[in-house]
């Protein structure tokens, strides 16, 4: 009997959890040669993104490993972790504990005017508590940074403050006005919960929101500082103290990045200049008649900062404003977040190193980590290979893009530290978990802001990652030439080590080709290749955007594909590449295996699985993403890839198999 | 203190310009958005026009009755604000006060005004 | 355009009294309302913003209200020193409109 000869399907626990999932997400009475969006992700318009559900399952995971009743080492990372959690968790001793934990928080920074009592006190010294005992920035953002000439150097920046409230330079006047009230609503909320007289509460919430409003004003747009090479302008302490004199730049900065030793000769990166001159302005003005307001913003400012470690009076006075101010963005309504995923984001944000450990343990053991490297290097072989066949590359360039994927690093689903238990077990001596949640926030926030920066402080780091393990999204630091694939991506169902190959190439697979791709973006800039056949690149380019251009768009949808040329090409490319990998996989290694009931072959299940990572709902944001929307990302690649048609015996001219073919990569 | 002082007024015929001009001290001056608001005799005030900051690409909005006719400029290093009205008409008349935005909206500060008189 | 109607542009009241000038927008403005004062031969003076904000030295027996389309402006007890026009302004949307103006006089 021929058929015995054919793929086996997979009856194991993980593969028939999949087969349920492509089941339940997707639409088999759709042509898939017309629609494959549809046939993959039909179900699942309506649902969240494939990587948000992947996000929340990572999180009901760590969930899980810190519900579990543990004896851990006293005083250790661990305990720490789980200590903190049940705390935040601890609502009852919240609600108890009321506004008194941020009365004293407020009493310490010299009280305000809005509850009575106030010491008018040092302008700088509060600012000062702030940026360093806080972590709060009312008026710019310090942070530590790669040096723009030389990214393994940490430089400290200056960049404009972030605002708490989604303000847009080209607003126009009424939805400005109308998130200005909204926002003076939350203040006063704020203020009346915190005992003020309602009175001076608006009067002080008012002014607040007129400080928001100047700052707001003063910045720069990027492209504007860009344009005229204000974006990173090297400036000494000194030389920003003449600049900006309201502020007190050498102690704040100093008491902010303990332990490092500042001078006032120490070099900064600024990154608007003239913000912070007319920033200092407006303090200095403020400062001369109305010192109290000025307390009062940069307080009010905090308690907003803090509010997510408040009562529920807090939490939901925070609710109803943002969901005011999604309704007036015209966003759609936030779901509401349960209090536990609330929780074990803060808990992974303030005992990382911890937490990390934990759950590569858990969800990225040995074989998991061995099969996903396995995975990559087969993409890697795929992409090397592909590079010596492309005919906008001479030979000098192929060499050159050779030498720069096998010099690249990977880091598969966790950063070194993490692999490492005894590097990872720390000891967070210096937090204290206080009597009430918020003074145990505000300790962690402490702890935190030094580990930062003595991680900076460290000879030759190795590459710092900018997700966590957990996280769902890879990228490839070009100052590292070090490609990261997070643990929380490398899970079911994009990929398992049980699963059929099919699935691991064409959803893992594709994502690790994708990624690998942005090592050469900047050869697909204008300008960006010299040596290559620009003329054939040239043609490679604009047929791809005339390939993408031709989609119908699905209503209310938009996007804007200068913004996404880049990522289109990656997304073709790496399907392709995936799919060259996985053939040459086939050709070397038998027993491959499907999913039962589905009636789809390995290939088909390639597709499949590529198209599925892909799920999601289109949302207005869609205009401003570098992707294109869903269905463009799953349909530009596939119906730029011949064997799709093949295989799923699509006629000439369907939409899915056009005439013409655009090749890139 | 805040001080705002207008000049420029005066008898124009019809069809003629005129460019008013408003001296500010007492402030930083580039730091507020500034305005023209006007006040026909006898009547109520009118806004007329609205002058962002460099940082907002010294962006301006103006009543729909001056749009064309007036123009609302800056120049930061004078701490000044102008208004150049052309083909003027009798109902252009009135005190033409300049004013400061305290912050994206009240006029908190106000000169003492100046007349414009359209009249053949 | 939005229309701030000040239906009374006249209103009598005496020293000590209590008065309110009403002021109705032909939209919804969003408490983005303010109140000036202008005395006889001056030039007008900020009272009131976000509808009941008192601005900086603006003695507390002014007080503003309301929301939505309708807004007031009450002074709790007339002192001789408030005989003046007063106008109600939106700036919640270009152009930036006035009311008519209410005529305060003492009797």
């Known amino acids: 009997n021929f058929q015995n000869c054919g793929p086996r399907p997979c009856e194991t626990s993980v593969c028939l959890d999949l087969r349920d999932h492509y089941l339940a997400s997707g639409n088999t009475s759709v042509a898939p040669c017309t629609d494959f969006f549809s046939f993959a992700c039909g179900r699942a318009k309506e649902t969240n993104n494939s990587f948000q559900e992947l996000a929340t399952k990572n999180k009901n995971r760590l969930r899980r490993i810190l519900e579990v009743q543990n004896s851990w080492h006293p005083g250790s990372g661990e305990e720490k972790a789980f200590q903190f959690y049940n705390s935040c968790m601890d609502t009852l001793a919240i609600e108890a504990a009321g506004t008194g934990p941020l009365r004293q928080v407020i009493e310490e920074l010299g009280g305000w005017r809005i509850s009575g009592k106030w010491t008018s006190l040092n302008f700088n010294r509060t600012l000062r508590l702030l940026m360093s005992q806080y972590g709060h920035f009312p008026f710019f953002r310090a942070y530590l940074g790669p040096h723009p000439a030389s990214p393994h150097t940490p430089v400290i920046q200056i960049d404009q403050p972030e605002f708490d409230v989604p303000l847009k330079q080209d607003q126009e006047q009424k939805i400005y006005a109308q998130i200005f009230r909204e926002y003076l609503t939350y203040l006063n909320q704020l203020g009346t919960l915190l005992g003020g007289d309602p009175s001076k509460v608006q009067e002080h919430s008012s002014l607040s929101i007129s400080i928001t409003s100047r700052l707001f004003q003063f910045l720069r747009p990027l492209e504007q500082r860009r344009a005229q090479g204000k974006l990173f302008q090297m400036v000494t302490i000194d030389q920003l103290k003449e600049m900006a004199p309201a502020i007190d730049w050498l102690s704040c900065l100093q008491a902010t990045f303990t332990p490092m030793s500042l001078s006032p000769s120490q070099s900064l990166v600024v990154h608007d200049v003239e913000y912070l001159k007319n920033m200092s302005q407006l303090v200095e003005e403020m400062l001369l008649k109305q010192r109290d307001f000025l307390q009062s913003h940069m307080i009010l400012g905090l308690v907003v900062t803090l509010s997510p470690a408040l009562d529920s009076q807090f939490q939901e006075a925070r609710r109803k404003l943002s969901q005011k101010l999604r309704e007036l963005t015209e966003q759609p309504p936030m779901p509401a977040r349960p209090r536990w995923m609330k929780c074990v984001e803060e808990t992974g944000t303030f005992f990382e190193p911890t937490l990390a450990a934990l759950f590569v343990r858990e969800a990225f053991g040995p074989s998991t980590r061995s099969a996903a490297m396995k995975l990559f290097t087969a993409i890697r072989d795929a992409l090397i290979t592909r590079l010596r066949n492309l005919p906008w590359m001479n030979e000098e360039t192929q060499n050159m893009a050779q030498d720069k994927v096998a010099q690249l690093q990977v880091e598969m689903g966790a950063s070194e530290w993490a692999l490492k238990p005894e590097l990872a077990r720390q000891e967070y001596n210096d937090i204290q978990l206080g009597s009430s949640f918020l003074q145990s926030v505000l300790s962690c926030v402490r702890s935190l802001r030094a580990r930062i920066v003595q991680s900076f402080l460290q000879p030759h780091p190795q590459h710092r990652w900018k997700v966590s393990p957990w996280d769902v999204n890879a990228y490839y630091s070009v100052s590292d030439h070090v490609v990261v694939f997070p643990a929380g991506l490398l899970q079911p169902p994009f990929f398992h080590p049980g699963y059929p190959r099919a699935v691991n190439f064409g959803a893992a697979g594709s994502i690790m080709a994708h990624e690998l791709l942005h090592i050469f973006y900047q050869l697909l800039l204008p300008g960006g290749c010299l040596a290559c056949d620009n003329h054939a690149l040239q043609e490679a380019h604009l047929c791809l955007k005339r390939h993408y251009a031709a989609f119908p768009l699905p209503s209310r949808t938009s996007f804007n594909d200068s913004l996404t040329f880049l990522e289109n090409a990656a997304d073709v490319g790496g399907l392709a590449i995936a799919l060259q990998a996985y053939s040459k996989r086939l050709l070397r290694h038998h027993g491959e295996t499907v999913l039962p009931s589905l009636d789809l072959s390995p290939q088909q299940i390639f597709f499949r699985s590529y198209a599925q990572v892909m799920c999601r709902k289109p949302s207005p944001q869609d205009s401003h993403d570098t992707h294109s929307p869903p269905h463009l990302r799953v349909h530009g690649p596939l119906s730029s890839t011949p064997a799709f048609a093949r295989y799923f015996r699509c006629a000439r001219g369907a939409l899915l198999n056009p005439s013409s073919r655009c090749q890139l990569w | 203190e805040v001080k705002l002082e207008e000049s420029g007024g005066g008898l124009v015929q019809p069809g003629g310009s005129m460019k008013l001009s408003c001296v500010a001290s007492g402030f930083t001056f580039s730091n507020y958005w500034m305005n023209w608001v006007r006040q026909p005799p006898e009547k109520g005030l009118e806004w007329v026009a609205e002058?962002?900051?460099?940082?907002?690409?010294?962006?301006?909005h103006y009543a729909e009755s001056v749009k064309g006719k007036f123009t609302i400029s800056r120049d930061d290093s004078k701490s000044s604000v102008y208004l150049q009205m052309n083909d003027l008409r009798a109902e252009d008349t009135g005190i033409y006060y300049c004013?400061?935005?305290?912050?994206?909206?009240?006029?908190?500060?106000w000169g003492q005004g100046t007349l414009v008189t359209v009249s053949a | 355009d939005i229309v701030m109607t000040q239906s009374h542009k006249f209103m009598s009241t005496s020293v000590g009294d209590r008065v309110s000038i009403t002021c109705k927008a032909s939209q919804d403005v969003s408490t983005v309302v303010a109140w000036y004062q202008q005395k006889p031969g001056q030039s007008p003076k900020l009272l009131i913003y976000?509808?009941?904000t008192r601005h900086t030295g603006v003695p507390d027996r002014f007080t503003g209200s309301g929301s939505g389309t309708d807004y007031t402006l009450t002074i709790s007890s007339v002192q001789a020193e408030d005989l003046a026009l007063y106008y109600c302004q939106q700036h919640y949307t270009t152009p930036f409109t006035f009311g008519s103006g209410t005529k305060l006089e003492i009797k």
């Open positions: 004013t400061r935005n305290w912050d994206f909206a009240w006029f908190d500060s």
């Open positions: 002058i962002r900051l460099n940082s907002n690409n010294y962006a301006t």
């Open positions: 976000w509808a009941s």
